[in-house]
């Protein structure tokens, strides 16, 4: 898998999207995990609703939310109030039994808030994207869903 880079500004929200083949992953729950080291395990952060038909409902774990458009085939993860320690490698996963298939590898980069004049010494500034093979950068601007904007759940 290539790594897709998503950049967000410290203190703001970052929305990460993971497209997938909706037929191939039909009926499967999804998850967002953080890669621990290059070869280490991927530690689960948040997963979609236990009932697949309710995957469109947003689930939170701390400041991270997940929602799945199972018909359109897009998993969306929101990282609220982005912090420097949120930077790193993640995966979007499709779950089956105790196993998981990687839908997308994601590098989250946290940029300093240009309006924040405090000491930014503890901010992590990412290196060159080229260090990731065929890395693709997406500048993500997120917004909250409006009331009544939740997609209608699929019927099967």
């Amino acid at each position: 898998h290539n790594t897709t880079v998503f950049q967000g500004v410290a203190g703001q929200s970052l929305q990460v999207s993971c497209p997938y083949d909706s037929m191939k992953h039909w009926g499967r729950r999804k998850a967002w995990c953080r890669q621990l080291g290059e070869k280490g395990p991927c530690q689960r952060v948040v997963s979609t609703h236990n009932l697949w038909l309710l995957s469109f409902l947003r689930r939170w774990n701390g400041s991270t939310a997940i929602t799945d458009d199972t018909l359109g085939g897009t998993l969306t993860i929101t990282l609220r109030n982005l912090q420097p320690h949120d930077a790193g490698l993640y995966q979007c996963q499709s779950l089956h039994g105790s196993e998981a298939d990687t839908l997308r590898k994601v590098l989250v980069e946290v940029l300093a808030d240009p309006l924040d004049h405090r000491d930014a010494g503890d901010l992590w500034f990412p290196g060159e994207s080229e260090s990731f093979e065929d890395a693709h950068v997406e500048h993500s601007i997120s917004r909250s869903l409006l009331e009544g904007e939740i997609p209608f759940p699929p019927t099967s």
């Epitope: 083949d21 037929m23 039909w26 039994g97």
Partner: antibody
Framework: EVQLQQSGAELGKPGTSIKLSCKVS????????MHWVNQRPGKGLEWIGR????????VYGEKFKNKATLTADTSSNTAYMQLSQLKSDDTAIYFC???????????WGQGTLVTVSS | DIQMTQSPSFLSASVGDRVTINCKVS??????LNWYQQNLGEPPKPLIN???SLQTGVPSRFSGSGSGTDFTLTISSLQPEDVATYFC?????????FGSGTKLEIK
């Protein structure tokens, strides 16, 4: 209608390699995972491995890591399995089977009989 | 690897009998277990998905139950066409593993 058409019976000599094919019609293999399973004469079913045709990612059973190589050609909607360093106990029927969504092995190929003999 | 212990390995019953086949799994697989029927010279045919969900087109005399480590396939009233070999499969974790099979015949 989804159909999996496997290549014909193979007679292989010990130490050589053969390549089996499984052509899918009625479904885009990019939207599936393709598995291979074998069955030795009069025995049970044994899982060999699985390929994701969309990206080539594979998972193998420990026993088949140095025996089977799974590939797929999405342009022809065909999956392949190469068996190397053939031995007499590789004699078996080899099946391909589809996984997608929550459907596990709903669709199977008819099987290819591989006989290894000098 | 997850070990699958299927019993009995051979079963002889009369038409109309209630038949049960068991599959014991060496570790918890939740409900990630399927049952297949195989006739001689043919590929397996799916009967039961996720422990108890009847595959479309399969007669209702077939049913599955269990979760975790103990699973059962039941044929409520055995028919002549049910003569076959039956396998369980766990798809909870790699490598996938099959039961050794139960050969069913009519008395």
């Amino acid at each position: 209608e989804v159909q999996l058409q496997q290549s014909g019976a193979e007679l292989g000599k010990p130490g050589t390699s053969i390549k089996l094919s499984c052509k899918v019609s009625g479904f885009n293999i990019r939207s599936t995972f393709m598995h291979w399973v074998n069955q030795r004469p009069g025995k049970g079913l044994e899982w060999i491995g699985r390929i994701d045709p969309a990206n080539g990612n594979t998972v193998y059973g420990e026993k088949f890591k140095n025996k089977a190589t799974l590939t797929a050609d999405t342009s022809s909607n065909t999956a392949y399995m190469q068996l190397s360093q053939l031995k007499s106990d590789d004699t078996a029927i080899y099946f391909c089977a589809l996984e997608f969504g929550v459907s596990w092995f709903e669709y199977w190929g008819q099987g290819t009989l591989v006989t290894v003999s000098s | 690897d997850i070990q699958m212990t299927q019993s009995p390995s051979f079963l002889s019953a009369s038409v109309g009998d209630r038949v049960t086949i068991n599959c014991k799994v060496s570790q918890n697989v939740d409900r990630n277990l399927n049952w297949y029927q195989q006739n001689l010279g043919e590929p397996p045919k799916p009967l039961i998905n996720f422990a108890n969900s009847l595959q479309t087109g399969v007669p209702s005399r077939f049913s599955g139950s269990g979760s975790g480590t103990d699973f059962t396939l039941t044929i409520s009233s055995l028919q002549p066409e049910d003569v076959a070999t039956y396998f369980c499969l766990q798809h909870n974790s790699w490598p996938l593993t099959f039961g050794s099979g139960t050969k069913l015949e009519i008395k």
